[in-house]
Interface confidence: medium
């Protein structure tokens, strides 16, 4: 199936009848919470760094004859080294995260030769997307965060072809579809309404959607499942 | 002299202070950038291998094929006999899966299905051979001695293999090596 079969429209029903998913809904509070949490982390970190700067400035600007200049220079030198290490870490870690080297020497050789950088190593490619196929089990919220930290998003399914492919390789995994309660519509983590069939939707405790051997089904968001992440190339 | 020393240390302190401030600013920017990336679906920034990226075909697989490590795999959802599977793979300029090691299909380790692979018994060599003529490593399937020579081999990504009549219809995996 070509990818045009499902798009997200901005007006009323899909602009034409084969195109299914709807515009973002007003009620996307769950994902907004997630975004708020992320923003909170960001602001907190910035605040920490600002506080640090502020404290340093006040100390530096005070004339403290009782403290030997050598000591001040030494402290500043140590702070500089710590900051430099932090900068290096932040610059280096993301690339090492996305390029975990395989221990086997044969694989390392061939992987270096053919890894084009379309996707991080150990991820798979399929139809212009990269997928991280997780082995560990997490709750839906933990999975969402784990994927966000991998610079990607929790598995989204764009068409039936992709769903069939994913069920073939991994039939039980979280997807980026949830609802606030059984009285609310299903939405994607981007806030788009999700109209594809989700089995067991009438269970009020099942508010997160998972990929299942025969399509999508709802489950408890707190239960632990394997998770996959995806980003589009 | 003491005044000079004091001035020197103050100069060193001042320089270090400026370096600290600039490093702090850099750190602030880096932190902001790395956390801005935590949006729900950020644009993915490819790795540093720019030279290889220029040649976009160097490791792209055909649509509907899976790229993993240095190979492309076609994982069928329909079932065919072993021979039909082999012909299909050949028509796609690939061959039925030849396993390099037991964790080659790691990415689909939770799949329940069995798939035809490119292993068949050669009467001439009295051995199980891959399509390219290489012999089966005994470490790959410890149970291979129980395989019936007239049968073909279906493999499960959990590492299990079973021999079945070649006329049985199974899913299949084609493989293309990129390099």
């Amino acid at each position: 199936m070509d990818n045009q079969g499902v798009i997200y429209s901005d007006l009323n029903l899909p602009p034409n009848p084969k195109r299914k998913q709807q515009k973002p809904k007003g009620n996307t509070s769950s994902i907004l919470v997630t975004e708020q949490e992320i923003t909170y982390v960001e602001l907190n970190l910035q605040k920490t760094s600002q506080d640090f700067q502020g404290n340093y400035k006040t100390n530096h600007c005070k004339d403290l004859p009782s403290v030997p200049e050598k000591l001040i220079a030494g402290i500043l030198g140590i702070i500089c080294l710590i900051l430099m290490a932090s900068v290096v870490t932040i610059v280096v870690i993301p690339s090492t995260l996305t390029q975990k080297h395989n221990n086997s020497s044969l694989n390392t050789r061939t992987q270096k030769a053919c890894h084009c950088g379309h996707c991080p190593e150990e991820w798979i490619t399929y139809s212009n997307s990269c997928y991280y196929i997780g082995k560990e089990k997490r709750t839906w919220a933990e999975s969402l965060l784990a994927c966000t930290l991998k610079n990607s998003s929790l598995l989204s399914i764009d068409n039936e072809e992709e769903m069939k492919f994913l069920t073939a390789i991994s039939p039980s995994t979280w997807t980026g579809v949830f609802r606030d309660s059984s009285q609310h519509p299903w939405v994607t983590i981007n806030g788009l309404t999700f109209k594809h069939e989700i089995k067991d939707s009438d269970n009020a405790e099942h508010n997160c959607a998972m990929l299942h051997a025969r399509g999508l089904k709802s489950d408890r968001c707190g239960s632990s499942k394997i998770y996959h992440c995806k980003h589009k190339l | 002299m003491a005044v000079f020393k004091t001035t020197l240390w103050r100069l060193i302190s001042g320089t270090l202070g400026i370096i600290c401030l600039s490093l702090m600013a850099t750190l602030g920017i880096l932190l902001k950038n790395s956390f801005t990336k935590l949006s729900v679906e950020p644009a993915y920034t490819p790795g540093p291998n720019i030279e290889l990226q220029k040649d976009s075909d160097c490791c792209s697989c055909h649509e509907k094929w899976v790229g993993y490590r240095c190979n492309c795999y076609f994982i069928s959802s329909e079932e065919k006999t072993w021979n039909e599977s082999r012909h299909f793979c050949a028509s796609q300029k690939s061959s039925l899966l030849q396993l390099q090691n037991r964790d080659e299909l790691d990415f689909m380790s939770s799949s329940q299905h069995f798939y035809w692979i490119g292993l068949s018994y050669s009467e001439e060599h009295t051995a199980w051979l891959w399509e390219n003529g290489s012999a089966l490593s005994q470490y790959l399937f410890p149970s291979f001695e129980t395989f019936k020579p007239k049968n073909c081999i279906a493999y499960n990504s959990k590492g299990n293999a079973l021999d079945e009549s070649c006329e049985t219809k199974n899913r299949y995996i084609c493989k293309q090596q990129l390099i």
Partner: antibody, heavy 119, light 107 residues
Amino acid sequence: EVQLQQSVAELVRPGASVKLSCTASGFNIKNTYIDWVKQRPEQGLEWIGNIDPANGNTKYAPKFQGKATITADTSSNTAYVQLSSLTSEDTAIYYCARWGGWDVRFAYWGQGTLVTVSA
Amino acid sequence: DIKMTQSPSSMYASLGERVTITCKASQDINTYLSWFQQKPGKSPKTLIYRANRLVDGVPSRFSGSGSGQNYSLTISSLEYEDMGIYYCLQYDEFPLTFGAGTKLELK
């Protein structure tokens, strides 16, 4: 189990209106689209229109614009079509159908309501 | 509106026979076509969607093909329970439009 329950029959006078219901069980109508289809006796199928119950957005075939009004009540998990200014031409079976996701346009059908317009 | 021309309007066939029904759209519908079966007094039942995909639970003797404007439904070996009326539907554009139907009867 997914089901769409419709009333069996309605007898109405010419010029009057009728409101047909389609009650869903086994799923929440907010999570799908509901379409309405008309079938006159011994004739083919005609698409009337559909609704997204999550927001009330509707689409109609030009022929049924002004004739049919599609609504939904999510609290009772029911979709409706109201037919106005009825004539003998409106005598037909009216089916509701549910979209099945991806490219399956009508995955589930109601059993149909026969509307007879007669003096 | 897209017009769907279905043929034949009715046909007689024997059990075990291969049967083909065709549908022609007045413009390219990008394979957004479904086939339905309807038996007397019953609701329609979806057999095929997206021109060639079989709905779960539908026997494999039914198959669909086609692209652009021309589509067909084939029953490889006719069985008694296959008697009924068959409709095609285009869902490439609103309004959705059905073919007039093909009545399939036993010879």
